[in-house]
Structure formats: C-alpha cells, structure tokens
C-alpha cells in the first residue's frame, strides 16, 4: 500500500490523527509511529558559557 499523494504537504494536510501515548504523528510517513520523549536539561548555573544542548530519550519499544 502506498502513502497519500506526494503533493499533499504536511502543513496543508488534515490535522494529525490522535496517536496512542507511546506514539506520535510522523508527517513524513503520515502515520503514527513509536516516539521517545524530548527533554531539555536544567539550565547551567549563572556564568556558564553556553546553554545546555537539548537532547532526547530513546523511543520506547
């Protein structure tokens, strides 16, 4: 089975369908997929040279 028309851009397409809690909607494949959690580390103390980079937790299987 092929996905929807290629010309249907993600932002022009219907709103993402609700996904179960361990999933999120992937605009690329236009379906719910397994998703991990994004996390933003606590800010560094005052005077630190640069903000901590945003990172991620691995997707749940």
């Amino acid at each position: 089975m092929r996905r929807g028309p290629r010309s249907l851009r993600g932002r022009d397409a219907p709103a993402p369908t609700p996904c179960v809690p361990a999933e999120c909607f992937d605009l690329l494949v236009r379906h719910c997929v397994a998703c991990g959690l994004l996390r933003t580390p606590r800010p560094k103390p005052a005077g630190a040279s640069s903000p901590a980079p945003r990172t991620a937790l691995q997707p749940q299987e």
């Epitope: 089975m1 999120c24 494949v29």
Partner: antibody, heavy 125, light 107 residues
C-alpha cells in the same frame, strides 16, 4: 543493541535484478519507518525509498520509481529492496537506516539514527 | 520535491576553529531538518534532529539552529575527529531530501 545489517549486493549487468536485505535486531521494525539511502562512488547521499512496515506505506525517489520495490517482513524483522531494470547509474553503496522519532507536541521530531554498514551494488557489463 | 542547498561545498579549517555550515530549503519546512556526519567508507551518523536537538552521545560542540528555510550547523571548536563530510536532510514531507554535502578539510 540496535543493529542493521544489509546483504545482497554484488555485480550485475545492466537490465538485471538484485534483492537487498536489511536485517534488524535490537528493535522491531514495525515501530518505525525503514529507509534505503544510496551513495554513488565519490558522490553525496541520495534517499531511495522508505517503508512503514506496520501499515505497508511506501514512497520512492523519482529516479527509481517503477523499477525498485521496498517491502518488509515483520515476522523476520527484515526490510527488502527489490531492484529491477538496473542501470549503470544505480551503482552505489546502499544503506538501510531506521528513522527515530521523538514526541514534540504530538508530532515526530527525528532523523535516521541507526544505519547499516552498507552493501555495494555495481551495475556493469 | 523540496531541494536542500548546502554551503559551502567544502571548507578548510584548523583544530580549534569555529565552523559554520548552512543549508537552505526551497520551501518552508518548519524545523524538520537533521544533520549527519560521514567519514570515508563509513555510514553517516546522526548529529542533530529537529534543527536544534542534539542526538544522544553527540559532543556538545555541535549545535544546530534555524527554522523555515534557513538552517545552520555549528562546530564551536573543531576537533581532529571532526574532519568529515556533513549533510543536511529535510523530513517535513516525502521524499526526504539531502543537501549535497560539505567537506570539512584540514587547513
């Protein structure tokens, strides 16, 4: 440990066929999309095709559409790329890769996090 | 299809330099950009996803920024192991497309 292992590459004559396999371990392919990306000698990366094994959705680069078919067998945790009507310009190292997703306001934020070692396909007479 | 145009195509730099690579999309793609590093004979490695999120295990000297059509990968202090080719890729819409690559060489 997540691992992707490609196989099936080799030397084939123009017009011939090959079937590449991408065996996954450490995760289930039904939970994400699997992609084939190729790299011709001395050139950049070119995306070829993807499959979403859970529902069978697929898409292809224009350069291979009608000649290549991507598929997956979730029972074997393996994705495949059937390549027919091969041309000299299909000569490349073929990689399979997993797309990882992270939940950002309900939408995937991600990239291809695990790649195989690559398998060389040479199309020549 | 969305085209991703990277610049420069190559650059020479020294250890400790700050290096910036840019990628421009032919259409607005929000923040759906990933950056990869590739060394000769090896598979690419994911560095940055969603334009600015550092992938697990990637050194914090790598950072990404941008949204819409213009994106940047920055290496704050180039290390010997960073000499490689870097690619951007969009995943806002299929087909996902790569930039042509930027080769970072030793000056």
């Amino acid at each position: 440990e997540v691992q992707l292992v490609e196989s099936g590459g080799g030397l084939v004559q123009p017009g011939g066929s090959l079937r590449l396999s991408c065996a996954a371990s450490g995760f289930t392919i039904s939970s994400s999309s699997i992609h084939w990306v190729r790299q011709a000698p001395g050139k950049g990366l070119e995306w070829v095709a993807w499959v979403l094994p859970s529902v069978g959705f697929t898409d292809y680069a224009d350069s291979v559409k009608g000649r290549f078919t991507i598929s997956a067998d979730t029972s074997k945790n393996t994705a495949y790329l059937q390549m027919n009507s091969l041309r000299a310009e299909d000569t490349a190292v073929y990689y399979c890769a997993r797309r990882v997703c992270y939940n950002r306001l309900g939408v995937c934020a991600g990239g291809m996090d695990y790649w195989g070692q690559g398998t060389l396909v040479t199309v020549s007479s | 299809d969305i085209q991703m145009t990277q610049s420069p195509s190559s650059l020479s730099a020294s250890v400790g330099d700050r290096v910036t690579i840019t990628c421009r999309a032919s259409e607005e793609i929000a923040t759906a950009v990933a950056w990869y590093q590739q060394k000769p004979g090896k598979a690419p490695k994911l560095l940055i996803f969603a334009a600015s999120f550092l992938y697990s295990g990637v050194p914090s000297r790598f950072s990404g920024s941008g949204s819409g059509t213009d994106f940047t990968l920055t290496i704050s202090s180039l290390q010997p192991e960073d000499f490689a080719t870097y690619y951007c890729q969009q995943s806002e819409v299929s087909p996902p497309t790569f930039g042509q690559g930027t080769k970072v060489e030793i000056k």
